[in-house]
């Protein structure tokens, strides 16, 4: 629909509260270093302007595009050049190049201080003193640290954040009530951010076709009773929503997401029997609920796939007439029958099928050529099954922390050039696949594990893209979206790597380690482990285990000592010497 004033249209559709929140998120995701107060000022100016356009859509500048209005506003920031350097050059460009320029400068790893959680009483006072500012600050801090966070979903998180404080700040034991809720929101938020980052990477690096294929597979698993035409409609609409959010068009994205949720709920009967509860909830909860809804039951009477996709004489005719539609139908039919497969596996099967048709439909006897195409699927299915089986056995044997350590060693040997903080972060997240997925029965393990690993490996890819240091990482990240995990799995020890010079400072520890949380202490130890492997990439598991066990004992001993600092200094020197001897450094 053509509207005289786009900003008025979105303000009316979304309402003032959501409009302001989404503009704040958009600005914070673009200008990640700007102080909170500056953003609030800009948002208020945009909101006042939007209100004038609601009152009179013909008013001056009301006909301008949102990119033009928001870009002009961002470019008024006085310290743009000093704070952002070359990003200031974006302001010399015209739309749409200016917006593209801002997008390219989004930083997945901004140099911002870690968010430290204040005391509960301090937070509750701040919440009561000015609830609106408190919640805006939450949106701002999350958005600037996660520049691709799915904006309408961040509104849902903020709603839960507010509910937690409303409830817990009145409780007898505020901390016992609030802290678990905040921990849950933090962990869910990180997961949500990472999942959305993969969607944006899929769209931006591999194009709309790649995203649509992912969506066909996932929605077909989730809604196996829905017709192909219905799934196709949902995929088209969902692609539009995510293209908008990934492109910084947050008002349009939130508006279209609400429309999609409305459509799904109005057409539940032809989509899924599992939507009833979701559709009774308010908008933000409804959209979240639909996005997380469990897979519907598969129709009982689904015929064999072979009839239409292998045995039919019309396979090449159907393929020639509409390649992507035919492949989409194949993917839909395969996915709805296989909720037990990961989406990336389904996409690999579809790619294999496509490659086979490309080759065989050129032949004089296509059927003779593609008759055995389904046999080619067997090794593709078995590879992730075997990998998950082996890794779940290892996880059950070691527990999460030691399983993470095994992955840290494995990945440091594969790509030792990658920065230590990135290796630690990524390997810790890879290791979480164990507690997240290995508890599931066989039928749910693969979709849980491999699709989660895709999300985590994408974190490695986006962090590495900022400062590329390894050709092997670049290759695995860029060649094929669906084969990233198999590509990394197939990497062996990098024989070209020149071991890092030994630096005693890297292995010098102080008494402050004793006051750290268990998680922070683990990170310290895992950082040391990565550095060890970088110094001695050929060290055996046994050697590394011995050194790490000695290290754990050293930390425990010194944290119990009366003079902790002296203990760390003296025993630390001994530990370094012993470790050097053990590893032959």
């Amino acid at each position: 629909d053509a509207h005289k004033s786009e900003v008025a249209h979105r303000f009316k559709d979304l309402g003032e509260e959501n409009f302001k929140a989404l503009v704040l998120i958009a600005f914070a995701q673009y200008l990640q270093q700007c102080p909170f107060e500056d953003h609030v000022k800009l948002v208020n100016e945009v909101t006042e302007f939007a209100k004038t356009c609601v009152a009179d859509e013909s008013a001056e500048n009301c006909d301008k595009s949102l990119h033009t209005l928001f870009g002009d506003k961002l470019c008024t920031v006085a310290t743009l050049r000093e704070t952002y350097g070359e990003m200031a050059d974006c302001c010399a460009k015209q739309e749409p190049e200016r917006n593209e320029c801002f997008l390219q400068h989004k930083d997945d790893n901004p140099n911002l201080p870690r968010l430290v959680r204040p005391e509960v009483d301090v937070m509750c006072t701040a919440f009561h003193d000015n609830e609106e500012t408190f919640l805006k600050k939450y949106l701002y801090e999350i958005a600037r640290r996660h520049p691709y966070f799915y904006a309408p979903e961040l509104l849902f998180f903020a709603k839960r954040y507010k509910a937690a404080f409303t409830e817990c700040c009145q409780a007898a034991d505020k901390a016992a009530c609030l802290l678990p809720k905040l921990d849950e929101l933090r962990d869910e938020g990180k997961a949500s951010s990472a999942k959305q980052r993969l969607k944006c990477a899929s769209l931006q690096k591999f194009g709309e076709r790649a995203f649509k294929a992912w969506a066909v597979a996932r929605l077909s698993q989730r809604f196996p009773k829905a017709e192909f035409a219905e799934v196709s409609k949902l995929v088209t609409d969902l692609t539009k929503v995510h293209t908008e959010c990934c492109h910084g068009d947050l008002l349009e994205c939130a508006d279209d997401r609400a429309d999609l949720a409305k459509y799904i709920c109005e057409n539940q009967d032809s989509i899924s029997s599992k939507l009833k509860e979701c559709c009774e909830k308010p908008l933000l909860e409804k959209s979240h609920c639909i996005a997380e809804v469990e897979n519907d039951e598969m129709p009982a009477d689904l015929p064999s796939l072979a009839a239409d996709f292998v045995e039919s004489k019309d396979v090449c005719k159907n393929y020639a007439e509409a390649k992507d539609v035919f492949l989409g139908m194949f993917l839909y039919e395969y996915a709805r029958r296989h909720p037990d497969y990961s989406v990336v596996l389904l996409l690999r099967l579809a790619k294999t099928y496509e490659t086979t048709l490309e080759k065989c439909c050129a032949a004089a006897d296509p059927h003779e050529c593609y008759a055995k195409v389904f046999d080619e699927f067997k090794p593709l299915v078995e590879e992730p099954q075997n990998l998950i089986k082996q890794n779940c056995e290892l996880f059950e044997q070691l527990g999460e922390y030691k399983f993470q350590n095994a992955l840290l060693v494995r990945y440091t040997k594969k790509v030792p050039q990658v920065s230590t903080p990135t290796l630690v972060e990524v390997s810790r997240n890879l290791g979480k696949v164990g507690s997240k997925c290995c508890k599931h029965p066989e039928a749910k393990r693969m979709p849980c594990a491999e699709d989660y690993l895709s999300v985590v490996l994408n974190q490695l890819c986006v962090l590495h893209e900022k400062t590329p240091v390894s050709d092997r990482v670049t290759k695995c990240c860029t060649e094929s979206l669906v084969n990233r995990r198999p590509c990394f799995s197939a990497l062996e020890v990098d024989e070209t790597y020149v071991p890092k010079e030994f630096n005693a400072e890297t292995f010098t520890f102080h008494a402050d380690i004793c006051t750290l949380s268990e998680k922070e202490r683990q990170i310290k130890k895992q950082t040391a482990l990565v550095e060890l492997v970088k110094h001695k990439p050929k060290a055996t598991k046994e050697q590394l285990k011995a050194v790490m066990d000695d290290f754990a004992a050293f930390v425990e001993k010194c944290c119990k000592a009366d003079d902790k600092e002296t203990c760390f200094a003296e025993e630390g020197k001994k530990l370094v010497a012993a470790s050097q001897a053990a590893l032959g450094l």
Epitope: C316, A320, A362, P366, H367
Partner: nanobody, 115 residues
């Protein structure tokens, strides 16, 4: 939209010759193997001949082997069927198809062999 337009049919005496053409559009002709299929009055479709995308590999039904020759010109997006030594039993509607499909997606061209 895929379109296949056959031409070249007609009435011919037994022992005579005809050359059928099929002009293709709406898809990447040079990437697909093609076939000729025929349907005699009151009968089901019968595959006649096939050719791969490059024109190197050709196949024929036993009933036409040695008499018919399939060929293609990818620069013109056209498929051909040279029919020699025609017999009354070759009378049928001939149509071209993608791959080995026997479903009719076009009008076809009528070949009548009669004295």
């Amino acid at each position: 939209e895929v379109q296949l337009l056959e031409s070249g049919g007609g009435l011919v005496q037994p022992g005579g010759s005809l050359r059928l053409s099929c002009a293709a559009s709406g898809f990447t002709f040079s990437s697909f193997g093609m076939s000729w299929v025929r349907q005699a009055p009151g009968k089901g479709p019968e595959w006649v001949s096939a050719i791969d995308s490059g024109g190197a590999d050709t196949r024929y039904a036993e009933t036409v082997k040695g008499r018919f020759t399939i060929s293609r010109d990818n620069s013109k997006n056209t498929l051909y069927l040279q029919m020699n030594s025609l017999r009354p039993e070759d009378t049928a509607v001939y149509y071209c198809t993608i791959g080995r499909s026997t479903s009719r997606g076009s009008q076809g061209t009528l070949v009548t062999v009669s004295s």
